[in-house]
Interface confidence: medium
């Protein structure tokens, strides 16, 4: 038959070349001389000249050694042609299939891998996968399958055996407890792969493992017991830092400290807060403290890490002793601020009131009382008694001076301490309106036509508070009334001016008289220009010279 | 101020030994990896071995076995133990900071080093 | 172990000039869990002990001038001093530390023209 079963060639043959492989042959050379040519990559294609045949035999040659990891299998056709060149068989289908031989050493990936793991980790856990190639053939020989082994480990520490490698995947896990990072924070793995499943070929690599901090060290405080010396009343002073050591690794959640005051400070008078580079406790004063109501505190704190411990760790902590120290504490003013209602335009000499200050501190020391801020020059106040009297007339309409009816006032308490301290109070004194002030119109000018004249209204204002103000009453006096009118309106604020005969054109004075409600009496003279017009003027027309 | 002065140097016989030191200030031994780096007469740097915080070590090929590292916390001294010294091992011995305990600090630069102490190696 | 290879071993170059000196290792230098190159460049000047200038193959240390600048990833790096200065002179080391044992490059001297 025209057929010839799938060819077997190790590669890497040794020849000698050309090497005879299996010989084609046709039951038509019976009949007549036949001629045999292959065809195909291999032969009359690239790589051209593998393989021929001998034309007239039809043996199959093979040239040169084969490479499997180049070429793995080729297909080829064999002819049959007879003399005349005709063809006297179909194509036939030739396959050559190069067996493997060992000719590859397993390669790495990489030289050198890089993984991490947590310190602290139960055997088992996966680390990182390592990978090596060979280009040999792993599925019909073991040429080709590599097995994975770690040759060596360094450091040795705390035993040479601290990861295993799955001679399979490549898998490299921990498999012994006691990776502790504070110890030995990276280890250097030798591994190698084996070809033949671990029988053949070695190569080797480098699998550096990074051991990560797990927060497995409790800070501890160094020293654990302080004495501070405090001032009193200072707030935000900085009373003691705290030091504590951490074997985890720096400035990572599970080396900064976290402090906790667990005792001592039940007025909630200290603070602490954690510096962020010396990881240092700093505490400080959040409230002053009171010498008087307590000279000695006794602080408990605790400290712990930002990070969760990862196992049941003792926590660490400090006794501060601190010592208040007595400072020579200034007067208070009892109230800080004092508002007295007084009535203005009272008599000098007559008392205001008494203001005074206490002294924090135990001794029994004198307190001296002066006046620190007085605008206007109103008071005075006694040194021993803090009484406060007026010296000058309270004026609440004085616009200057008075803001709201309240005029204030700063005084000063000074104790004989040594340096002595100074205290400062506020004193508002609040103003109650007198009927001071009589009514008085705006404008005081007005110009008025002398024919058919238009009513001028004035506005009426009191510098005094109601009631000393509206309804206001208006009378004309010396005479004004025989040419004038005057009449409040109905609301009481406004004062209508009305020329009730002719005047010539000149100016005039008006004697208006008003009054408040509390009837305080106030004479204006309204100076009223009379023109020679019709109506409403604003000046006289026409060239005028004033009388 | 972060400072390291090594000393023990000197002139030594083939096979001999030698205890060089590495005294640091400024910052606690025991925090940061330390470093001995040589340099060979006119040559380059060669690295030779650490010493970790935790007291864990690694050392080159070419001294692993001969030499050893390290430290008295309490002195804040670091120390390399030279036993069985060859020719080859003439060379400046500085001590070197790493720049952090910890793999993001960039452990292995080693940012303060040293002046040196010349170890001579010679019959 | 990683070999560094620097280029050229030695250059001269005019006050105010720029300067690339380039480091090659024998195996990637860059650890692919957080994208950083383990590399180091080092200053030399004759009596002293190295100084670092750069780590993370990019990042300058505290104190040195911004005229010193490192690039580069995986297996090839460069130094560059942008405007050469007469205090330059000096021999420039580059280090891997991506695994043990560290190695150095052997060097490149640094002189003015």
């Known amino acids: 038959d025209w057929v010839v079963a799938p060819i077997s060639v190790p590669e890497n043959g040794k020849g000698p070349f050309p090497q005879r492989l299996n010989q084609l042959k046709s039951n038509k050379d019976r009949d007549t001389k036949i001629f045999y040519s292959i065809t195909g990559p291999g032969a009359d294609s690239p790589p051209e000249g593998v393989f021929a045949v001998e034309k007239e035999t039809g043996w199959l040659l093979l040239n040169k050694p084969l490479d499997r990891e180049e070429i793995a299998k080729y297909e080829l056709f064999g002819h049959a042609v007879s003399e005349n060149g005709a063809s006297v068989e179909d194509p036939m289908n030739i396959s050559i299939i190069v067996t493997d031989q060992n000719d590859h050493k397993p390669k790495f990936t990489q030289d050198t891998f890089r993984g991490s793991v947590l310190e602290g980790v139960l055997p088992g856990t996966s680390v990182m996968q390592v990978t090596a190639t060979d280009e040999d053939d792993a599925i019909y020989t073991y040429n080709g399958v590599v097995a994975y082994s770690i040759h060596s480990q360094e450091p040795k520490d705390p035993h040479d055996l601290m990861f295993t490698i799955h001679r399979s995947t490549g898998t490299i896990s921990v498999i012994s407890s006691g990776l502790d990072r504070e110890k030995v924070p990276e280890y250097t793995l030798t591994i190698q792969a084996t070809d033949m499943d671990g029988d053949g070929s070695t190569t080797t690599a480098v699998a550096v493992v990074e051991i990560l901090d797990a927060n497995d060290n409790a800070p501890m405080f160094d020293p654990q017991k302080y004495e501070a010396h405090v001032p009193e009343n200072a707030v935000g002073h900085e009373v003691q830092r705290l030091t504590v050591t951490d074997l985890d690794a720096p400035n990572s959640p599970a080396w900064r400290a976290t402090y906790l005051i667990m005792g001592g400070d039940d007025g909630d008078h200290f603070t602490i807060t954690t510096h962020p580079e010396s990881n240092q406790g700093i505490l400080t004063t959040r409230k002053g403290l009171d010498f008087e109501a307590k000279n000695q505190h006794t602080l408990y704190v605790e400290v712990t890490n930002e990070a969760p411990f990862v196992l049941k760790l003792p926590t660490s902590t400090a006794t501060i002793v601190v010592h208040v120290e007595d400072v020579n504490e200034a007067p208070v003013f009892v109230p800080p601020s004092k508002v007295v209602e007084v009535q203005e335009g009272i008599p000098t000499g007559e008392p205001v009131c008494v203001y005074t200050a206490e002294d924090p501190d135990k001794e029994n020391q004198k307190i001296s009382y002066r006046i620190l801020r007085d605008p206007a020059g109103w008071l005075a106040m006694d040194p021993d008694s803090g009484q406060v009297t007026a010296v000058g007339t309270l004026d609440r309409e004085d616009e200057q001076f008075v803001r709201n009816n309240i005029y204030e006032v700063m005084v000063l308490a000074m104790d004989n301490g040594s340096p002595p301290t100074t205290g400062t109070g506020t004193l508002l004194l609040t103003l109650i309106d007198v009927n001071d002030h009589g009514p008085v119109p705006e404008p005081r000018q007005i110009t008025i036509c002398n024919q058919s004249p238009v009513r001028q209204v004035l506005n009426i204002t009191d510098k005094d508070l109601s009631p000393h103000t509206s309804p206001f009453q208006a009378q004309l006096t010396d005479d004004s009334d025989i040419y004038w009118t005057a009449e409040v309106n109905e609301e009481g604020d406004t004062v209508v001016l009305s020329l009730k005969k002719f005047l010539k054109q000149d100016t005039y004075d008006v004697h208006l008289s008003l009054s408040d409600h509390g009837n305080k009496e106030q004479l204006t003279v309204i100076r009223a220009t009379v023109c020679d017009c019709h109506g409403h003027v604003e000046t006289c027309p026409g060239p005028w010279k004033g009388g | 101020e972060v400072q390291l002065l090594e000393s023990g140097g000197g002139l030594v016989q083939p096979g001999g030994s030698l205890r060089l030191s590495c005294a640091v200030s400024?910052?606690?031994?025991?925090?940061?990896?330390i470093n001995w780096v040589r340099q060979a007469p006119g040559k380059g740097l060669e690295w030779v071995s650490v010493?970790?915080?935790?007291?864990?070590?690694n050392y080159a090929s070419s001294v692993k076995g001969r030499f050893t590292i390290s430290r008295d916390n309490s002195k804040n001294t670091l120390y390399l133990q030279m036993n069985s010294l060859r020719a080859e091992d003439t060379a400046v011995y500085y001590c070197?900071?790493?720049?952090?305990?910890?793999?993001?600090?960039?452990?292995?630069?080693?940012?303060?080093w040293g002046q040196g102490t010349l170890v001579t190696v010679s019959s | 172990d990683i070999v560094m290879t620097q280029s050229p071993d030695s250059l001269a170059v005019s006050v105010g000039e720029r300067v690339t000196i380039n480091c090659k290792s024998s195996?990637?230098?860059?650890?692919?869990?957080?994208?950083?190159?383990?590399l180091a460049w080092y200053q030399q000047k004759p009596g002293q002990p190295p100084k670092l200038l750069i780590y993370?193959?990019?990042t300058r240390e505290s104190g040195v001038p911004d005229r010193f600048s490192g690039s580069g990833s995986g297996t090839d790096f460069t130094l560059t001093i942008s405007s050469l200065q007469a205090e330059d002179v000096a021999v420039y080391y580059c280090?891997?530390?991506?695994?043990?044992?560290?190695?150095f490059g052997q060097g490149t001297k640094l002189e003015i023209k």
């Open positions: 070197a900071k790493s720049r952090g305990v910890y793999d993001f600090d960039g452990r292995g630069a080693m940012d303060y």
């Open positions: 400024g910052f606690t031994l025991s925090s940061y990896p």
């Open positions: 010493i970790w915080t935790g007291g864990g070590t």
């Open positions: 195996q990637s230098l860059l650890y692919s869990s957080n994208q950083k190159n383990y």
């Open positions: 993370w193959a990019s």
């Open positions: 280090q891997q530390y991506y695994s043990y044992p560290y190695t």
